[in-house]
Amino acid sequence: MHHHHHHHHHHAAGLNDIFEAQKIEWHEAAIEGRSITGISPITEYLASLSTYNDQSITFALEDESYEIYVEDLKKDEKKDKVLLSYYESQHPSNESGDGVDGKMLMVTLSPTKDFWLHANNKEHSVELHKCEKPLPDQAFFVLHNMHSNCVSFECKTDPGVFIGVKDNHLALIKVDSSENLCTENILFKLSET
């Protein structure tokens, strides 16, 4: 099995430095009344995405169709990467997440140019859509740093609903209580390799 998790906090720790450097920009943006989510991402990060059980998330995209696989990767295969773009959430949150001054970190996830993961809350599905910026709210997920160097992705559009794994596919999973936040099927590992 692949063990990615030891790479994760190398990046997450570095975010604190980025926050410090960005505070002036956020402050100025607030004074000028500019939308904070309208500015550029705080940072961008290419990472492979795997489940708590070390299965890889891979993306098979064509112009008119796509498939997202959750699978054990072959030994000689390179892992797919997603481009995670980090934003500061507009709304303060009481929940425990990575953030500055009580604000949450949000991310968008892109497996290739012009495509982003979207939450389809009606169908409880995770979809890939081609779209232009500014991205719709369905493309934003609140990032939570969990135990064992794992992260989880909570829908901006539907708090309490997370990207998770169901029947070897990505799906949206409703989490009823804070104890269930540690349920394995919504935990993911990020790796730079």
Epitope: K74, D76, D80, K113, D114
Partner: antibody, heavy 126, light 106 residues
């Protein structure tokens, strides 16, 4: 509908040059890695060269390295193969092939060839 | 360089099963693809990622891959399946094809 149309083949003397083109339509050309694959008369398929979509990295078979150059023009939806110092053993039908899936950020040539052109014949002979 | 070995020819009666092998070092650690090529035509992808069929490819085509051998199986072979078949893998950002197998339907 995905279409790949090769052109530029013909008869050329040993040591000569040719430039093949592959006009692509029916898909977002700039999102897919592309390759050239050849087939000598009565022989099997041989991968020749490939080019990434994201950073335009190029890859070559040892048999053509230093003589052939692959390139692409995303604004024209066209793939090219510049062939120099041609030899008799380069005689083949040259196919343009598109990867099955859009290239992931990780890059490189990783996917099977989902679509093929009809091929263009290159004959190297004196 | 990486080498994939296929039998030059396989003969099968209509309705019977044809199996084409493709051998390479640690083949099972890579994803295998299979292409069908009929005389005078361009190749067509029939199996990718070892076992998956593109849309439009009949269910009688199936694939497997483990150890040092990938196998393409044609169940209930039909006359129209007579063609050359090539296996292929990606190795260090290059495409590697097997030598091809001519399937003859008797």
């Amino acid at each position: 509908e995905v279409q790949l149309l090769e052109s530029g083949g013909g008869l050329v003397q040993p040591g000569g040059s040719l430039r093949l083109s592959c006009a692509a339509s029916g898909f977002t050309f700039s999102s897919y890695a592309m390759s050239w694959v050849r087939q000598a008369p009565g022989k099997g398929l041989e991968w020749v060269s490939g080019i990434s979509a994201i950073d335009q990295s190029t890859y070559y078979a040892d048999s053509v390295k230093g003589r052939f150059t692959i390139s692409r023009d995303n604004s024209k939806n066209t793939l090219y193969l510049q062939m120099n110092s041609l030899r008799a053993e380069d005689t083949a039908v040259y196919y343009c092939a598109r990867d099955l899936w859009m290239e992931n950020w990780v890059g490189g040539l990783r996917y099977p060839f989902g679509y093929w052109g009809q091929g263009t014949m290159v004959t190297v002979s004196s | 360089s990486y080498v994939l070995t296929q039998p030059p020819s396989v003969s099968v009666s209509p309705g019977q099963t044809a199996s084409i092998t493709c051998s390479g070092e640690r083949m099972g650690d890579k994803y295998a693809a299979w292409y069908q090529q009929k005389p005078g035509q361009s190749p067509v992808l029939v199996i990718y990622r070892d076992t998956k069929r593109p849309s439009g490819i009949p269910e009688r085509f199936s694939g497997s891959n483990s150890g040092n051998t990938a196998t393409l199986t044609i169940s209930g072979t039909q006359a129209m399946d007579e063609a050359d078949y090539y296996c292929e893998v990606k190795k260090s950002d290059t495409g590697v094809f097997g030598g091809g197998t001519k399937v003859t339907v008797l």
